[in-house]
Amino acid sequence: MMTGTIETTGNISAEKGGSIILQCHLSSTTAQVTQVNWEQQDQLLAICNADLGWHISPSFKDRVAPGPGLGLTLQSLTVNDTGEYFCIYHTYPDGTYTGRIFLEVLESSVAEHGARFQIP
């Protein structure tokens, strides 16, 4: 039975040209995290495997930095980066947990962070 929950940074906004940290946290389970995959709609951004370390997809290698922790730092933001991002936690023995973050990249300096929220 999957008892864990994923807490994410929720709906966030950031300025064009700036950077943002995408972060998820798995709680309420003793399952071992074997890997975290970061995805944007239909493409992979990065993988952090507990044994092997990080894989950064070539399309993002100049703009994505691993961390902090299992999170991901997205740099040199453009308006095209607006959209949904997913953290996919591969765990043993529970299986897979998925968290969702919506990022809006704004032209002006009115960007504000959204509230944190939980996905069961």
Epitope: I47, N49, D51, H55
Partner: antibody, heavy 119, light 107 residues
């Protein structure tokens, strides 16, 4: 330039063990991942496992779990694949492959090592 | 484990033909797929990764596409040196796995 050079062909009896080496040159060994793949005669590629020489972290194919061990010696820039309790269906060419930095894309390959298991 | 199923298993074609090889994953693998080319008695060579980037030195007649579970490798105009076996490979989640291969033969 990056090179992976594997040890020579081996002939083993069923039940024995084999240890194949993969010596790396031309790069910082600990910045790479080394994976092992085998290919039985006339068959396709079978993924065996992968090691991060920097951390020693490993991951193995479930089918081989318990029989295979991947290690790396940072002092000699050499990765090793040991397979125990050999059976005739372990007869194959064993390849090592390397991937640099933050990537799971393996673009450097060893020349392959033929391991023959026969009584 | 994630199964990678290639089709067709073998294919006969002529020089100049356009050829498409498909690879279907048993579950979502996003864009964590690469393609290798292997000739008899040789180590595989990386062709395409992620899954639409051509590796250094790979001719532009090779292209790849796909996301999620369905992937394709296309050779726009077959050359004599392209007759080989092609494999897809997923690195989305361990254990990583290969397709069974597609043997491309001269018609």
């Amino acid at each position: 330039q990056v090179q992976l050079v594997q040890s020579g062909a081996e002939v083993k009896k069923p039940g024995a063990s084999v240890k194949v080496s993969c010596k790396a040159s031309g790069y910082a060994f600990t910045n790479y991942l080394i994976e092992w793949i085998r290919q039985a005669p006339g068959q396709g590629l079978e993924w065996m496992g992968v090691i991060n020489p920097g951390s020693g972290g490993t991951n193995y194919a479930q089918k081989l779990q318990g029989r295979v061990t991947l290690t790396a010696d940072k002092s000699t820039n050499t990765a090793y694949m040991e397979l125990r309790s050999l059976r005739s269906d372990d007869t194959a060419v064993y390849f090592c492959a390397g991937s640099y930095g933050s990537s799971y894309t393996f673009d450097y390959w060893g020349q392959g090592t033929l391991v023959t298991v026969s009584s | 484990d994630i199964q990678m199923t290639q089709s067709p298993s073998s294919l006969s074609a002529s020089v100049g033909d356009r050829v498409t090889i498909t690879c279907r994953a048993s579950q979502h693998v996003s864009t964590a797929v690469v393609w290798y080319q292997q000739k008899p008695g040789k180590a595989p060579k990386l062709l395409i990764y992620s899954p639409s980037y051509r590796y250094t030195g790979v001719p532009s007649r090779f292209s790849g596409s796909g996301s999620g579970t369905d992937f394709t490798l296309t050779i726009s105009s077959l050359q004599p040196e392209d007759f080989a076996t092609y494999y897809c490979h997923q690195h989305y989640s361990t254990p990583w796995t290969f397709g069974q291969g597609t043997k491309l033969e001269i018609k």
